[in-house]
Interface confidence: medium
């Protein structure tokens, strides 16, 4: 058995349902998406050995499903998946990877073929610990690369300052696949939000630890950089579920500390 969870039940139905639902969110000129063709292009990876799937195996899938990302609406993240999805609000506020069509159809899903058979493996799928070229990691690598290339204007990044290993994972999708593919000529500045869990530890904040590494890397690449601790609109959303916690006592907006380059 592999270390990861098996293929999600009803994978095709979920995929096609999400695709059809998402088409309604696209502008009329971008709405002509063939969900079955997109599924078939995605399914190319399901015909391959589960440790032999490359990011490029998803090229056609990306080419059929990609669409423009509104300027200033990109939201990158690490270790804050659920919070990002909630805050983005189905593209209303922002459009993270999970809110573009090619990310939406696969969000929180798992998939792989059986090792020596053509059927799907519903028991387990490989993770990066099992093999690098597994279907799910290769998918998100390819999707992350495309998302970065298509992002423009102000780039927003939500990081988790309560993460024990630090807010900015030196080895992660943001570091390895997204930052290198940002198109400098299309980007005005990068704004980082370091969020801390309500009642959780404050492991890192702007300008500390791994955040200094990130700041240096982005500045060295020539990006204008700013960092905000506990960006208030996101903090208010976190507080919906913790309304009586002291961290959620209403204070002036000035309480959110800010460091600008």
């Amino acid at each position: 058995r592999w270390r990861g969870e098996g293929t999600s039940a009803h994978l095709r139905d979920i995929f096609l349902g999400r695709c059809a639902e998402y088409r309604a969110l696209l502008s009329p000129e971008q709405r002509n998406k063939n969900c079955t063709a997109i599924w078939e292009a995605f399914k190319v990876a399901l015909d391959k050995d589960p440790c032999s799937v490359l990011p490029s195996d998803y090229d056609l899938f990306i080419n059929l499903s990609r669409h423009s990302i509104p300027r200033d609406k990109s939201l990158f993240w690490e270790n804050s998946h659920l919070l990002v999805n909630s805050f983005a609000d189905n593209t209303r506020r922002f459009m993270p990877l999970s809110d573009v069509l090619y990310g939406r159809v696969a969000d929180f899903l798992s998939w792989c073929r059986q090792k020596n058979d053509s059927g799907l493996d519903y028991q387990s799928c490989p993770t990066s610990e099992d093999c690098e070229n597994n279907p799910v990691d290769s998918f998100w690598k390819r999707a992350s690369i495309q998302y970065s290339k298509d992002s423009s204007g102000v780039i927003h990044v939500m990081l988790n300052g309560s993460e024990p290993t630090g807010a900015y994972p030196i080895k992660g999708f943001f570091a390895d696949y997204e930052i290198p593919n940002l198109q400098k000529e299309k980007i005005t500045r990068i704004e980082i939000w370091v969020m801390h869990e309500i009642g959780g530890p404050n492991v890192e904040s702007c300008g500390e630890g791994s955040m200094k590494v990130l700041e240096k890397r982005l500045k060295d690449m020539g990006f204008q950089y700013s960092c905000i601790n506990d960006y208030r609109p996101v903090k208010l959303l976190q507080c919906v579920d913790h309304s009586t916690h002291p961290d959620c006592a209403l204070k002036s907006a000035a309480a959110a500390t800010q460091r600008k380059a």
């Epitope: 059809a20 079955t36 063709a37 078939e40």
Partner: antibody, heavy 116, light 106 residues
């Protein structure tokens, strides 16, 4: 085994329209894209476009936009292609084929001859 | 659109010969597909994902390549292999085919 059965040859007058069919059997019709490919006499293959039988959405090669119209009838597992304003340039064999990007299954082809 | 250029456009060969057909794409593509077509028939898939043999295709057929340059090889030409061969790119719509290579009996 998947099988695509196309309608018979058509002899049509210039300026008229023609509608040909492609009946699928041996697999779940709604699960696979149906493509249409043109082959003029002695020439190569040209991809016209495809249709998603599940939702009915279409994707056309720009060269054929306005010339071809793709439809499906789920109840009869049949895909259709209508060609309008026919000219001698439209005289060709038209194939239907299954797949989103490459085609392991093809119909036998429908010959369309446009006469003056 | 990605343009596909096959060479040669035709060739004459004898039974038992090794035959190589090349296909060049105008920009990089992920995979190449190869079809065989005989007169009056629909094309038949030979090779998918650049190098994999389609079901029922003899092992004398093989495919290779990457980026913009791809090759179909028939290791030992048989009488039933005299036909026209087409390459097709996978990477983006519109899907495009090469102009074909006709393999004739010498």
């Amino acid at each position: 085994q998947a099988y695509l059965q196309q309608s018979g040859p058509e002899l049509v007058k210039a300026g008229a329209s023609v509608k040909m069919s492609c009946k699928a059997s041996g697999y779940s019709f709604i699960e696979y894209t149906i493509n249409w490919v043109k082959q003029s006499h002695g020439k190569s293959l040209e991809w016209i476009g495809n249709i998603d039988p599940y939702y009915g959405t279409t994707y056309y090669n720009q060269m054929f936009t306005g010339k071809a119209t793709l439809t499906v009838d789920q109840s009869s597992n049949t895909a259709y292609m209508q060609l309008k304003s026919l000219t001698s340039e439209d005289s060709a064999v038209y194939f239907c084929a299954r797949g989103s990007a490459w085609f392991p299954y093809w119909g036998q082809g429908t010959l369309v001859t446009v006469s003056a | 659109d990605i343009q596909m250029t096959q060479s040669p456009s035709s060739l004459s060969a004898s039974v038992g010969d090794r035959v190589t057909i090349t296909c060049s794409a105008s920009s990089s593509v992920t995979y190449m597909y190869w079809y065989q077509q005989k007169p009056g028939k629909a094309p038949k898939l030979l090779i998918y994902d650049t190098s994999n043999l389609a079901s029922g295709v003899p092992s004398r057929f093989s495919g290779s390549g990457s980026g913009t340059d791809y090759t179909l090889t028939i290791s030992s030409l048989q009488p039933e292999d005299f036909a026209t061969y087409y390459c097709q790119q996978w990477s983006n719509y519109p899907l495009t085919f090469g102009q074909g290579t006709k393999v004739e009996i010498k």
